[in-house]
């Protein structure tokens, strides 16, 4: 099937980094300089994505892949190939539209980006606060009250935290 | 709220040049990119060129290097310049924010070329 | 440079119903693509970015869809506030570069 077809069709013996030149009797070409092709007979090359203004390069173009952009210091991406950067913010902090804000009591955010968080209720598992929480770290839940009641005999491991944004105040 | 305030001489006559200022408030200006944009009356939407705060900028090669941009980070400021002006350089200029598309835009300032 | 071409240059439609414009590039942009709306005498705003993405505040009857060089915005219903002129814009490659724009109009 291969062989019938590339008789059909010289242009898919062409591999992926070249194109299927029509001016020079459909002989493969090397793709051009900022330019790739990632599978093989292609007619034209792509060209590349320039990692321009906040944008910075993480992984050159080759000819046979596009270039990937991030963002530069300070900032993050945002949507489908990194199309949009973000201010990073502080731990404890959020990004709101009059720039950086420590979260509110009661909310944290371990990250440089996204939004604060509501601390865990512990008490919702029956659990207690075994360590609070800040704005830079939820709280960690304990073993419940009656189990660090005198004659207890063993205490229980704490329980993983639930999603915090999953638990209401 | 990031708010982007521009200004700067709405009428021109031909060979002069044009100078605008743009002022962000609230949010960051380091960091970020700062562009222009502008629109002959009528018309579609060109972008003239970019400035980060450090200074380092990029601009459309059809304005031929007759634009300049500057910048003043202790007053989150950057400016446009564009020399030897003529009726086709008539349009609304605005100044952006650049994060990959264009998130916060000025309010645009008319500027005319007559003589 | 990569040029944008936006097509219908205007669209005539009943509050409502659906809108759908679209955008060519004159090559392959992945899906660095950013769709705005302007108002007269308005700056453009930011609707959608990453061709997809819609952008802070944005309702959800705008949609963005397509990727290397066809793209779609969709309004889904149009509001009255949705009447304007729409503009693609690639990020992909230097210089960036628009479209012409697409004016929706009261039909």
């Known amino acids: 099937f291969e062989r019938t077809r590339s008789l059909q069709d010289p242009c898919s013996n062409c591999p992926a980094g070249t194109f299927c030149d029509n001016n020079r009797n459909q002989i493969c070409s090397p793709c051009p300089p900022n330019s790739f092709s990632s599978a093989g007979g292609q007619r034209t090359c792509d060209i590349c994505r320039q990692c321009k203004g906040v944008f910075r390069t993480r992984k050159e173009c080759s000819s046979t892949s596009n270039a990937e952009c991030d963002c530069t210091p300070g900032f993050h991406c945002l949507g489908a190939g990194c199309s949009m950067c973000e201010q990073d913010c502080k731990q404890g902090q959020e990004l709101t539209k009059k720039g950086c804000k420590d979260c509110c009591f009661g909310t944290f955010n371990d990250q440089k980006r996204g939004i604060c968080r509501p601390w865990t209720n512990c008490s919702l598992d029956g659990k207690s606060v075994l360590v609070n929480g800040t704005k830079e770290r939820d709280v960690v839940c304990g073993p419940s009250p009656a189990d660090l009641s005198p004659g207890a005999s063993s205490v229980t491991p704490p329980a993983p935290a639930r999603e915090p944004g999953h638990s209401p105040q | 709220q990031v708010q982007l305030q521009q200004w700067g001489a709405g009428l021109l006559k031909p060979s002069e040049t044009l100078s605008l200022t743009c002022a962000v408030y609230?949010?960051?200006?380091?960091?970020?990119?700062w562009s222009w944009i502008r629109q002959p009356p009528g018309k579609g939407l060109e972008w003239i060129g970019e400035?980060?705060?450090?200074?380092?900028?990029d601009s459309n090669p059809s304005l031929k290097g007759r634009v300049t941009f500057s910048v003043d980070t202790s007053k989150n400021q950057f400016s446009l310049k564009l020399n030897s002006v003529t009726a086709a350089d008539t349009a609304v200029y605005y100044c952006?924010?650049?994060?990959?598309?264009?998130?916060?835009w000025g309010q645009g300032t008319l500027v005319t070329v007559s003589s | 440079e990569i040029v944008m071409t936006q097509s219908p240059a205007t669209l005539s439609v009943s509050p409502g119903e659906r809108a759908t414009l679209s955008c060519r590039a004159s090559q392959s942009i992945s899906s660095i693509l950013a769709w705005y709306q302007q108002k007269p005498g308005q700056a453009p705003r930011l609707l959608i970015y990453?061709?997809?993405t819609r952008a802070t505040g944005i309702p959800a009857r705008f949609s963005g869809s397509g990727s290397g060089t066809e793209f779609t915005l969709t309004i889904s219903s149009l509001q009255s506030e949705d009447f304007a002129v729409y503009y693609c814009?690639?990020?992909?490659?230097?210089?960036?570069?628009f479209g012409g724009g697409t004016k929706v109009e009261i039909k």
């Open positions: 814009q690639q990020y992909y490659n230097w210089p960036l570069t």
């Open positions: 609230g949010g960051s200006f380091s960091g970020y990119y």
């Open positions: 400035i980060q705060h450090s200074g380092s900028t």
């Open positions: 952006a924010r650049l994060t990959g598309p264009f998130d916060y």
């Open positions: 990453g061709a997809s």
